[in-house]
C-alpha cells in the first residue's frame, strides 16, 4: 500500500475578522495508526492549535467526528478569527509510539490570511489658526486593517486634493496595517463652513468608504477689516462715531476706544452678525462730547481678535470746525500687524 | 480589465539561471493565489509552481523542486519565478496564471519563452 | 500524483456537429477538474471549473459533466471558433495540480 500523505488541499484560506476559517486536511490512509496535530508555524517555536488526543481548545471544532476509525479527514474551523491568527497552519500526522507518540507527516500548509476592516480614518488639523492664503497641513490616520492594498483620498467641499503624501505601515508583511496622509489645504476667506474630507476605501468595506472630517471653521482666522465713520450730530456738543468690525472668525473680539490716545471704553463682542460665509460683523459706536475739548480729537478704534496683536484705525475730529460741517477722515495708523495672526 | 504581463524569458546555457516577473493589474492581487505554468514546443500544460496569498505557503512540481523558487511582491502587484540550474527540457513558454479559490486558473497571461539551449 | 488522461488525442468533425471529449483521473478528484481551451499562439481560457460550471464569457454550447474518476467536456453545434487544444486540469487535492495530454478538435 502507498504510504499516507497528508493533503492540505489550500494554499491560502481569506476570512474576515469575527468569522470562522475552515482549514482542511486529509490524509490518504489509515495506516500508521496515531493522532493528528494542528499546529501554527513550523519548527521548535511552533504553536499548537490543536490536538486530536488531548487538551482543550475552545475555538477549535473539527469538520468531522475524529473518534470514528475509518475517519480521514482532519479539517477544522477556527471561531472569532482576528488578524493575530493570520499565519501558516500544518496539519501534522503522528505515529502512535511510546513513551511519546513521533512526528510522521506534515501537510504542505495552509495560509491563513485575516481581512480586517480599517478603523474609522481620523482627521486632525494643525494645533494653531491660520489666515486665509496661508497653507495649512491635515493629518488622516486608520488602523488595522488587512490586506495591505488600501486607497485614500482627500477632499476639501466635495473636490479632490492632489497635494498629499500618503505612507502604509509596515512596508513588509504584517498580520495588520495603519496609514497616514498628510495634506496641504490653502486657506481662503471663505472657508469657514469648509470641510476636509479624508476618504479610505479598502476590499472589506464592499464599495463603501470611511470618512473622517475636519471642519476648517476649527484652523481658519479671518481677520476684520476696520471702519470708523462719523455719524450725523445728535445734539449740537455731540458727535456719534461707529467703528464697523467686519467678515472676521472666530467671534472672540475686544474693542477699545481711545480718545488722543487715552482708553475710553473697552468692550467685548457680543450681539454680532453672522455673514452667508460664516464670518461675522460687529459695531461699536462712541459718542463723543465736543464741548469737552479744547484741542482736536484723535478717535482710535483698537480691535484685538482672538488673542492677535491689536489692529487699529484712526479718525480725526476738529473741534474748531461747527461740528455740523465735519468731514469723515479716516486716515489709517496701524498699531499692529493685519497680516500677522498667530495665537 | 485582468491583466498578466510576464516578462524575463530569454535563451540561456543549462546550467545556468533566469528570473521571471509576472506584473499583474485590474484585480487585487492580494486576493489570489498565483501559479506558473509551462508548456515545452509541440507539448502539453504543465503546473510548475504556486504561491499563498502572502507567500508563506509554496508548492513546486516534482521536476523543478529544489531548482526553482516562486515569490511574490503585493507591494509592486508582481508574481517572480526563479530559475536556477537550467536544463534543455526546462525550454518552454511559462505562462503566469491566477487562481481561483480552489485552485484552478481563471486569467493567463501571454506567456513569455525560455530556452536552454548550449 | 493524480494522473489525468483524455481521449481522443485527434477528434475530427464537421462544424454544427457536437464534440465529445473524455477526462480520466487516476484517482477520486470529487468534482475538482476544469477544462480549458487553447488555440494555435495564445493562452489557455478557462472554459469549465467545478467539473460543471461555466466560466464567466463561456456560451452555453460548453457543457461539463462527471464526478470522481471520469469527466466529459461536450461541445454542442461546433462554430469555427472551437476548433483548438482542450486540456482537463484536477485540483483540490494538494500539489501538484497536474494537466490531461490535451485533445485537439480538428476540423474534418
Known amino acids: 500500500e502507498e504510504e499516507l500523505q497528508v493533503i492540505q488541499p489550500d494554499k491560502s484560506v481569506l476570512v474576515a475578522a469575527g468569522e470562522t476559517a475552515t482549514l482542511r486536511c486529509t490524509a490518504t490512509s489509515l495506516i500508521p495508526v496515531g493522532p493528528i496535530q494542528w499546529f501554527r508555524g513550523a519548527g521548535p517555536g511552533r504553536e499548537l492549535i490543536y490536538n486530536q488526543k488531548e487538551g482543550h481548545f475552545p475555538r477549535v471544532t473539527t469538520v468531522s467526528d475524529l473518534t470514528k476509525r475509518n475517519n480521514m479527514d482532519f479539517s477544522i474551523r477556527i471561531g472569532n478569527i482576528t488578524p493575530a491568527d493570520a499565519g501558516t497552519y500544518y496539519c501534522v500526522k503522528f505515529r502512535k509510539g511510546s513513551p511519546d507518540d513521533v512526528e510522521f507527516k506534515s501537510g504542505a500548509g495552509t495560509e491563513l490570511s485575516v481581512r480586517a476592516k480599517p478603523s474609522a480614518p481620523v482627521v486632525s488639523g494643525p494645533a494653531a489658526r491660520a489666515t486665509p492664503q496661508h497653507t495649512v497641513s491635515f493629518t488622516c490616520e486608520s488602523h488595522g486593517f488587512s490586506p495591505r492594498d488600501i486607497t485614500l483620498k482627500w477632499f476639501k467641499n466635495g473636490n479632490e486634493l492632489s497635494d498629499f503624501q500618503t505612507n502604509v505601515d509596515p512596508v513588509g508583511e504584517s498580520v495588520s496595517y495603519s496609514i497616514h496622509s498628510t495634506a496641504k489645504v490653502v486657506l481662503t476667506r471663505e472657508d469657514v463652513h469648509s470641510q476636509v474630507i479624508c476618504e479610505v476605501a479598502h476590499v472589506t468595506l464592499q464599495g463603501d468608504p470611511l470618512r473622517g472630517t475636519a471642519n476648517l471653521s476649527e484652523t481658519i482666522r479671518v481677520p476684520p477689516t476696520l471702519e470708523v465713520t462719523q455719524q450725523p450730530v445728535r445734539a449740537e456738543n455731540q458727535v456719534n462715531v461707529t467703528c464697523q468690525v467686519r467678515k472676521f472668525y472666530p467671534q472672540r473680539l475686544q474693542l477699545t476706544w481711545l480718545e488722543n490716545g487715552n482708553v475710553s471704553r473697552t468692550e467685548t463682542a457680543s450681539t454680532v452678525t453672522e455673514n452667508k460665509d460664516g464670518t461675522y460683523n460687529w459695531m461699536s459706536w462712541l459718542l463723543v462730547n465736543v464741548s469737552a475739548h479744547r484741542d482736536d480729537v484723535k478717535l482710535t478704534c483698537q480691535v484685538e481678535h482672538d488673542g492677535q496683536p491689536a489692529v487699529s484705525k484712526s479718525h480725526d475730529l476738529k473741534v474748531s470746525a461747527h461740528p455740523k460741517e465735519q468731514g469723515s477722515n479716516t486716515a489709517a495708523e496701524n498699531t499692529g500687524s493685519n497680516e500677522r495672526n498667530i495665537y | 480589465d485582468v491583466q498578466l504581463v510576464e516578462s524575463g524569458g530569454g535563451v540561456v546555457r543549462p546550467g545556468e539561471s533566469l528570473r521571471l516577473s509576472c506584473a499583474a493589474s485590474?484585480?487585487?492581487?492580494?486576493?489570489?493565489?498565483m501559479s506558473w505554468v509551462r508548456q515545452g514546443p509541440g507539448e502539453g500544460l504543465e503546473w510548475v509552481a504556486g504561491?499563498?496569498?502572502?507567500?508563506?505557503?509554496?508548492w513546486y512540481a516534482d521536476s523543478v523542486k529544489g531548482r526553482f523558487t516562486i515569490s511574490r511582491d503585493n507591494s509592486k502587484n508582481t508574481l517572480y519565478l526563479r530559475l536556477f540550474s537550467l536544463r534543455t527540457e526546462d525550454t518552454a513558454i511559462y505562462y503566469c496564471?491566477?487562481?481561483?479559490?480552489?485552485?484552478?486558473?481563471?486569467?493567463w497571461g501571454l506567456g513569455t519563452l525560455v530556452t536552454v539551449s548550449s | 500524483e493524480i494522473v489525468l488522461t483524455q481521449s481522443p488525442g485527434t477528434l475530427s468533425l464537421s462544424p454544427g456537429e457536437t464534440a465529445t471529449l473524455s477526462c480520466r483521473a487516476s484517482?477520486?478528484?470529487?468534482?475538482?477538474l476544469a477544462w480549458y481551451q487553447q488555440k494555435p499562439g495564445q493562452a489557455p481560457r478557462l472554459l469549465i471549473y467545478d467539473a460543471s460550471s461555466r466560466a464567466t464569457g463561456i456560451p452555453d454550447r460548453f457543457s461539463g459533466s462527471g464526478s470522481g474518476t471520469d469527466f466529459t467536456l461536450t461541445i454542442s453545434s461546433l462554430q469555427s471558433e472551437d476548433f483548438a487544444v482542450y486540456y482537463c486540469?484536477?485540483?483540490?487535492?494538494?500539489?501538484?495540480?497536474?494537466f490531461g495530454g490535451g485533445t485537439k478538435v480538428e476540423i474534418k
Open positions: 485590474g484585480f487585487a492581487f492580494s486576493d489570489h493565489d
Open positions: 486540469q484536477q485540483y483540490g487535492n494538494g500539489p501538484p495540480l497536474t
Open positions: 484517482q477520486n478528484v470529487r468534482s475538482n
Open positions: 504561491i499563498s496569498l502572502r507567500g508563506g505557503v509554496t
Open positions: 496564471a491566477r487562481e481561483s479559490w480552489n485552485t484552478f486558473f481563471d486569467y
